[in-house]
């Protein structure tokens, strides 16, 4: 904690300004008042101080906004940004997409991604949805930003927005996230030719379930094995092996290099071997001939 | 084949909590999204939301604030909570299915339960 | 939300005959709408869906016809079974919305 003193009448501070970069850190604490700070947030940023300096400028703030910034100043926090934490940010409320761009460009190239999950899960709870201006800012200068929302926030994307959103947008989402916007990336795209349709849905597949799955085995699509790898195992492993040598048509081959990785793996343990020797790519592991396979999730089910 | 089947309480009391429970059999919950479709005595549809067997939700936006859908995968269930019901709340509640395959690509349900008469008053 | 409007509310067309539904959307749908028919204190049942294609074990009477905005239900030749109540629904965008029925009834 910075130690309270009084400020010298030499020192007292009527602009926020360069001169203020030969102030010891307790003289800025004694002499820089935070209303003025407040006011003039936007000439911090222009002026070089060192680590130390910025915080004791935000321990001002912190004491003059005990509550959380206001967005004036947060919009002109400039690489004071740098010094928040993720329970900082959890106290504003930014509406504004220049607030957001201007953080997410002082953010860049410091590992600060929790804080930027919370300075956009703010955003998403401001604007009150994820909407297409907000997706196509994240898009623009946080690729990858939009999977580190939690699958509560993302379900506030209208699936009109979904078409903003590119493959590597998608590349952190998990399967929580993936089960939100699949859905509302196959209502978008609903109205799109087979192959072009498939072009777009793709990125999404991560989400989807069996059913989906096999319908798109018959629609001679040719999925990638990267794209294969990233499907839900439990959407994978009810597929037969005639799916999925229709699903992955030529790719089919890659499933030997796949063989110990799930779900190929996993997909495996539960064909029958006669099946998979038809691929004729040495595939081993599965069930052996003359063996029963007894179905006990729909037994249970059942009972 | 699959079947759907509704329960819980016909008659639940106006401010409290109306709990619903579709339990699927003869087939998994997996493999497809779940709908609660509610019509009031002598009117027509109307869908409250959906869920995928991992959790993923989505609600009609005139009843989101008082809609609870959560799964149990392992009972291969799936049920409805709605809060601060009504008279207006009066419905046979339906359990569906979404069909919704690429093939066909669309939001449609293929699958009903018999539905259940759920009646709001003190 | 798409409202979706059915005509005529009432409908008496005698067995044998033709009768025609009609559903129009609020906002364009496409073809994203489907058909159900549903009988005294029983659910609905699936008819069409892609405004056209009929559901597995539907019979070839019933028809549907439209795109955007205007939807039809056609049934080509009333059978005792088919007086129930038809809806329409969109699933063109959430929330899923139906149209508010038409009674199908002997004339």
């Known amino acids: 904690d910075v130690e309270r003193t009084t400020c010298p009448p030499e020192k007292e501070v009527h602009e926020i300004d360069e001169s203020l970069i030969f102030y010891k850190k307790r003289e800025l604490e004694a002499c820089v008042d935070a209303a003025l700070l407040a006011a003039q947030m936007d000439r911090v940023d222009a002026i070089p101080f060192t680590y130390e300096q910025l915080d004791v400028l935000k321990h001002k703030l912190d004491e003059l906004y005990p509550q959380g910034y206001p967005e004036s100043v947060i919009r002109h926090l400039g690489h004071l940004f740098l010094k928040m934490s993720p329970e900082d940010i959890r106290k504003w409320n930014v509406t504004s997409l220049e607030t957001l761009k201007a953080l997410l460009k002082v953010s860049k190239g410091h590992e600060m991604s929790a804080q930027v999950a919370t300075l956009i899960d703010r955003v998403v709870v401001g604007r009150g949805q994820l909407d297409k201006d907000t997706v196509d800012t994240l898009t623009a200068f946080c690729p990858g930003c939009l999977c580190s929302l939690s699958p509560e926030r993302l379900s506030s994307v209208p699936p009109s927005v979904i078409g903003a959103v590119r493959p590597q947008d998608l590349d952190t989402c998990g399967p929580r996230q993936l089960d939100v916007l699949y859905p509302k990336a196959r209502l978008a795209f609903q109205n799109m030719s087979g192959s072009e349709y498939f072009v777009k849905i793709r990125p999404f597949l991560g989400g989807a379930p069996t059913e989906d799955v096999k319908a798109l085995s018959q629609q001679n699509v040719s999925m990638d094995l990267a794209t294969f790898m990233k499907l839900r195992r439990e959407a994978v492993l009810p597929l037969t092996v005639a799916e999925v040598q229709k699903l992955l048509g030529p790719h089919v081959e890659g499933l030997k290099v796949e063989e110990q990785h799930s779900p190929v793996r996993d997909w495996i343990l539960k064909q029958r071997q006669d099946d998979l020797d038809t691929l004729g790519l040495g595939l081993q592991g599965g069930i052996p001939n003359g063996y029963l396979i007894l179905d006990l999730s729909v037994r249970e089910a059942l009972s | 084949q699959v079947q759907l089947q509704e329960s819980g309480p016909g008659l639940v009391k106006p401010s409290e909590t109306l709990s619903l429970t579709c339990t699927v059999s003869g087939g998994s919950i997996q493999n497809y999204y779940w709908s609660w479709v509610r019509q009031p005595p002598g009117k027509g549809l109307e869908w409250i939301g959906y869920?995928?067997?991992?959790?993923?939700?989505q609600s009609n936006p005139s009843l989101k604030s008082r809609v609870i859908i959560s799964v149990d995968t392992s009972k291969n269930q799936f049920s409805l909570k709605l809060s601060s019901v009504t008279a207006a709340d009066t419905a046979v509640y339906y359990c569906a299915r979404e069909v919704g395959r690429i093939a066909v690509a669309g939001w449609f349900f293929d699958l009903w339960g018999r539905g259940t008469l759920v009646t709001v008053s003190s | 939300e798409i409202v979706m409007t059915q005509s005529p509310a009432t409908l008496s067309v005698s067995p044998g005959e033709r009768a025609t539904l009609s559903c129009r959307a609020s906002?364009?749908?496409?073809?994203?709408l489907a058909w159900y028919q549903q009988k005294p204190g029983q659910a609905p049942r699936l008819l069409i869906y892609g405004a056209s294609t009929r559901a597995t074990g539907i019979p070839a009477r019933f028809s549907g016809s439209g795109s955007g905005t205007e939807f039809t239900l056609t049934i080509s030749s009333l059978q005792s079974e088919d007086f129930a109540v038809y809806y329409c629904?969109?699933?063109?965008?959430?929330?899923?919305?139906f149209g508010q029925g038409t009674r199908l009834e002997i004339k």
């Open positions: 629904q969109q699933y063109n965008n959430w929330p899923l919305t």
């Open positions: 869920i995928f067997y991992s959790g993923s939700t």
């Open positions: 906002q364009s749908v496409n073809a994203n």
